[in-house]
């Protein structure tokens, strides 16, 4: 509550996160024209990336384009991209939706369709739907440890969310353990009224708000965090504004002296840790 | 404008960016002593990196040092680094400018110059100028979609910069479309009074400021963002303070059971999205 | 000091860091069952990662698990993980401490111990202590250049910590050169009352606070930064809360048509640059 006689100061914060969990992934893998059921294990080094403190990312789904090489090939025949003659293809043109630069030729994409040829990483990425259900849907059971150090420099006061008395095998619960700073990802979504399984397909952004309302007067000292959760991306967003959360990255390698890459379109949850609050003192 | 009767609260913000565009790059490539004109396509996975929300980086230029291996070699003969005898070379010395540790020997760098031998990634990086014009100068035509979710927790108010009524094929313009959140990189520079082609050579930092001045009173409610742009790095900076914006990263691989790397010195624009403002309510 | 007649405004800040230095690393390397003393050089591309502006990471220590492949193997025999028969191993079980999924079989780990077999990246990571002393302990002599651009939009005032008069070969010192923005990492630790050599083993988080207390009135104008340093991670933290600072990342490659990876557990110092302060004007 506002104490008007107090000098208020905004919080200075530093965050450190640690994700734990492994996922078993089953997917169809095509090798030499034969499709087999592939399975693999993903651990933290596979599904998360060294991000900065107040944000962390957990990959929940992906689409791979393997063995791409810089050359010429037909572009992907998405809506409106097909052609019947070279007239439809403009040499040097870069369609923002396309992944390459047109050569001016209209060439066969498959037995039934023709598209403009492009200079690009080939074969170009297929614009297919993200797998449903999400490949790493079991990430719902991963946990994240959040360490938060805060400082009110004007009051020369420092504290942190983890106290020496805390138990490292706890799990946050709004009622039973509201001070525990180990969170199950599925619980975060539940608290925010969201469905993890659903969001995991396209990805999304989830806010973990840490609110410090600190009374630093010695006679009524109180300074503990309060956690709350809310979804930050717009689930009702129009296609044109890129719903969900994904990014592309590549693994480069050489084969027969030619540089190749595997392109990964990674869908996942970016968790933003938003720390705010004030310290008040007479 | 300041309404003194209102309770003001600073904004809590989360940002998500998505860059679009492809660049055609032409450069001289030397293979087996023969220099050819190389031609390649760069897409988002090649020129940008999964960074956190309120910052994104677009590579506009680069210098590559290929096939480096950990061994002994002469250091690069930059100003003041040449030697005529072993006396000039101090065993175990690490010159902050150099890329290795001196062995104590003075050895030929080429037919005319000798430098101190170092234990380093060899051959050491040549300290050559960034290519001019910049290799990815066409990044000027890339676009970035910026999604910004804001929250005033004390007023229990949340909104975002993208409204359902918005058109996903718009481009920001200060006068004609000041609420569109898709920005052409070249336009950002023009608005900030900067020359993209010039900055792209050495790199730089560009600020995209999003100002929310929100009146949350129901009778005169207003809460929309205002975008402005300013260059954040010092273009007049002395050489010793490292002008522009660049960083080095490496791609590691094995050849004949020896670990090698390709070192990339990436120049580019780091865009910092600076969100600020207040929400006021009676 | 508080001037009550002034209109105060919080600082809007952008930070750019540049780390310099090379480390000579000596470690035991086992190849084909033979252990040799390996010697290598680490430069910025090897020990630091392109992070965002207000944070940078310097790797000071590491543990490598080379040649991992997705297959079956005995899990690491940490406390309580050993078995004597298949009954002790639960098919499909994922122990949060383990790195894989149990197959239900109890198999030999070595000549004396048996553990549950897992489907995982194999051989599983050995849970061994971080090397002591730290492999990159010489990072103490690295330097970091910090560039900080600040803005008070309401007062339309911008400045930076580096002035044209500054000397690029300076090193920060609290007394002799408190405005120099090139910091030796060891000095930062010394100022914070911490031992770099000790923290380098397990890693940690160090705060570099930049405080701007700006009087923007023309008759008594003052706006220069004040630097201070404090450790942000809890050095007395219980094991269960993951003391220090480390993360795992992987380098993937193919051998004999099988994807393999080298897993690196990187320990190091994350430096958080915390910029705060106000600008006041009549």
């Amino acid at each position: 509550s506002d104490k008007l006689y107090q000098r208020k100061e905004p919080v200075i914060s530093s965050v450190h996160t640690k994700v734990k969990g492994i996922a078993e992934v089953t997917e169809n893998v095509t090798e030499g024209g034969v499709t087999k059921l592939g399975h693999s294990i993903f651990d933290t080094a596979d599904y998360t990336f060294p991000l900065q403190g107040n944000s962390f990312f957990v990959m929940t789904n992906y689409v791979k384009s393997e063995g791409q090489v810089q050359t010429l090939c037909p572009e992907y025949p998405r809506r409106g991209a097909q052609c019947s003659s070279d007239r439809r293809c403009k040499k040097g043109w870069m369609d923002p939706q396309s992944k390459g630069i047109q050569t001016g030729r209209c060439v066969p994409y498959d037995k039934t369709r023709k598209t403009c040829e492009v200079s690009a990483w080939c074969p170009t990425e297929e614009e297919k739907e993200a797998p449903r259900p999400a490949l790493l849907r079991s990430a719902e059971n991963f946990t994240v440890l959040i360490k938060n150090n805060i400082h009110f420099p004007g009051h020369n006061y420092t504290t942190r969310n983890i106290l020496p008395t805390m138990n490292g095998s706890c799990t946050f619960h709004k009622t039973w353990d509201p001070q525990c700073s180990i969170f199950r990802l599925g619980d975060i979504f539940q608290e925010a009224g969201e469905n993890f399984t659903e969001v995991a397909v396209q990805g999304g952004i989830m806010g973990i708000e840490i609110y410090w309302d600190c009374n630093l007067d010695s006679w009524s000292h109180h300074c503990r965090p309060r956690y709350s959760f809310r979804r930050l991306d717009d689930k009702n967003m129009d296609e044109s504004f890129v719903p969900g959360y994904n990014f592309r990255y590549a693994k480069y390698y050489k084969e027969n002296n030619v540089e190749k890459r595997t392109l990964i379109k990674a869908f996942g949850i970016r968790f933003d840790i938003l720390v705010f609050g004030t310290g008040g003192k007479f | 404008s300041d309404k003194l009767y209102q309770r003001k609260e600073p904004v809590i913000s989360s940002v998500h960016t998505k860059v679009k565009g492809i660049a055609e790059v032409t450069e001289n490539v030397t293979e087996g002593g023969v220099t050819k004109l190389g031609h390649s396509i760069f897409d988002t996975a090649d020129y940008t990196f999964p960074l956190q929300g309120n910052s994104f980086f677009v590579m506009t230029n680069y210098v590559k040092s290929e096939g480096q291996v950990q061994t002994l070699c002469p250091e690069y003969p930059r100003r003041g680094a040449q030697c005529s005898s072993d006396r000039r070379c101090k065993k175990g010395w690490m010159d902050p400018q150099s890329k290795g540790i001196q062995t104590g020997r003075c050895v030929p760098y080429d037919k005319t110059r000798k430098t101190c031998e170092v234990s380093a990634w060899c051959p050491t990086e040549e300290e050559k100028e960034a290519p001019r014009p910049a290799l990815l100068r066409s990044a000027e035509n890339f676009t970035v979609l910026i999604k910004n979710n804001i929250h005033f927790p004390g007023h229990n108010y949340t909104t975002r910069n993208i409204l359902p009524t918005m058109n996903g094929s718009c481009t920001f313009h200060k006068t004609w479309d000041p609420q569109c959140s898709i920005f052409r990189l070249g336009d950002i520079f023009q608005e900030a009074g900067e020359n993209f082609t010039e900055v792209a050579v050495q790199g730089g930092i560009m600020g995209i400021e999003i100002y929310w001045d929100c009146n949350l009173d129901s009778w005169s409610h207003h809460c929309r963002p205002r975008y402005s742009f300013r260059r954040l790095d010092d273009k007049n900076m002395d050489e010793s303070f490292v002008p522009g914006y660049n960083f080095r990263y490496a791609k590691y691989y094995k050849e004949n059971n020896v670990e090698k790397r390709t070192l990339i010195k990436a120049f580019g624009i780091r865009f910092d999205i600076l969100v600020f403002g207040t929400g006021g309510k009676f | 000091s508080d001037k009550l007649y002034q209109r105060k405004e919080p600082v809007i800040s952008s930070v750019h860091t540049k780390v310099k230095g090379i480390a000579e690393v000596t470690e035991n390397v086992t190849e084909g069952g033979v252990t040799k003393l390996g010697h290598s050089i680490f430069d910025t591309a090897d020990y630091t990662f392109p992070l965002q502006g207000n944070s940078f990471f310097v790797m000071t220590n590491y543990v490598k698990s080379e040649g991992q492949v997705q297959t079956l193997c005995p899990e690491y025999p940490r406390r309580g993980a050993q078995c004597s028969s298949d009954r002790r191993c639960k098919k499909g079980w994922m122990d949060p401490q383990s790195k894989g999924i149990q197959t239900g079989r109890c198999v030999p780990y070595d000549k004396t111990r048996k553990t549950c077999e897992v489907s995982a990246w194999c051989p599983t990571e050995e849970e061994k202590e971080a090397p002591r002393p730290a492999l990159l302990r010489s990072a103490e002599n690295f330097t970091v250049l910090i560039k900080n651009n600040i803005h008070f939009p309401g007062h339309n005032y911008t400045t930076r910590n580096i002035l044209p008069t500054m000397n690029g070969s300076c090193t920060f010192h609290k007394t002799w050169d408190p405005q120099c923005s090139i910091f030796r990492l060891g000095d930062i630790f010394q100022e914070a009352g911490e031992n770099f050599t000790e923290v380098a083993v397990q890693g940690g988080i160090m705060g570099i606070e930049i405080y701007w207390d700006c009087n923007l009135d023309s008759w008594s104008h003052h706006c220069r930064p004040r630097y201070s340093f404090r450790r942000l991670d809890d050095k007395n933290m219980d094991e269960s809360f993951v003391p220090g600072y480390n993360f795992r990342y992987a380098k993937y490659y193919k051998e004999n048509n099988v994807e393999k990876r080298t897993l690196i557990k990187a320990f190091g110092i994350r430096f958080d640059i915390l910029v705060f302060g106000t600008g006041g004007k009549f």
């Epitope: 087999k36 059921l37 592939g38 399975h39 | - | 297959t71 079956l72 079989r105 077999e117 489907s119 194999c122």
Partner: nanobody, 120 residues
Framework: EVQLVESGGGLVQPGGSLRLSCVVS????????MGWYRQAPGKQRELVAT???????NYADSVKGRFTIGRDNAKNTVYLQMNSLKPADTAVYYC??????????????WGRGTQVTVSS
Amino acid sequence: EVQLVESGGGLVQPGGSLRLSCVVSGSMYRIDNMGWYRQAPGKQRELVATVTRGDITNYADSVKGRFTIGRDNAKNTVYLQMNSLKPADTAVYYCNIDSYIIGAGVRDYWGRGTQVTVSS
């Protein structure tokens, strides 16, 4: 569905060499361990050598230094190069693989065997 076919067995003189091959066919995505076992008349089946998916090898003491196991993952094939053969190496040699299947655990598969006879 999964088939293992051994080849390369036969009659050889002491001190001679043979190379056994075993090809795995079927919709197997990931073969974890591949190995060779042998069974001499009137004796139990015993391990000869195994190789993991990560190319880690393990040999019975009696064949160390003489036999070499290897695998070609692209061809789903495991080899056993047998040098300095002795009469005691006479047996039926069986190819064995195991593969982890999500939900089902580890599955073991065996070939029908190929006869190796070492005799002068």
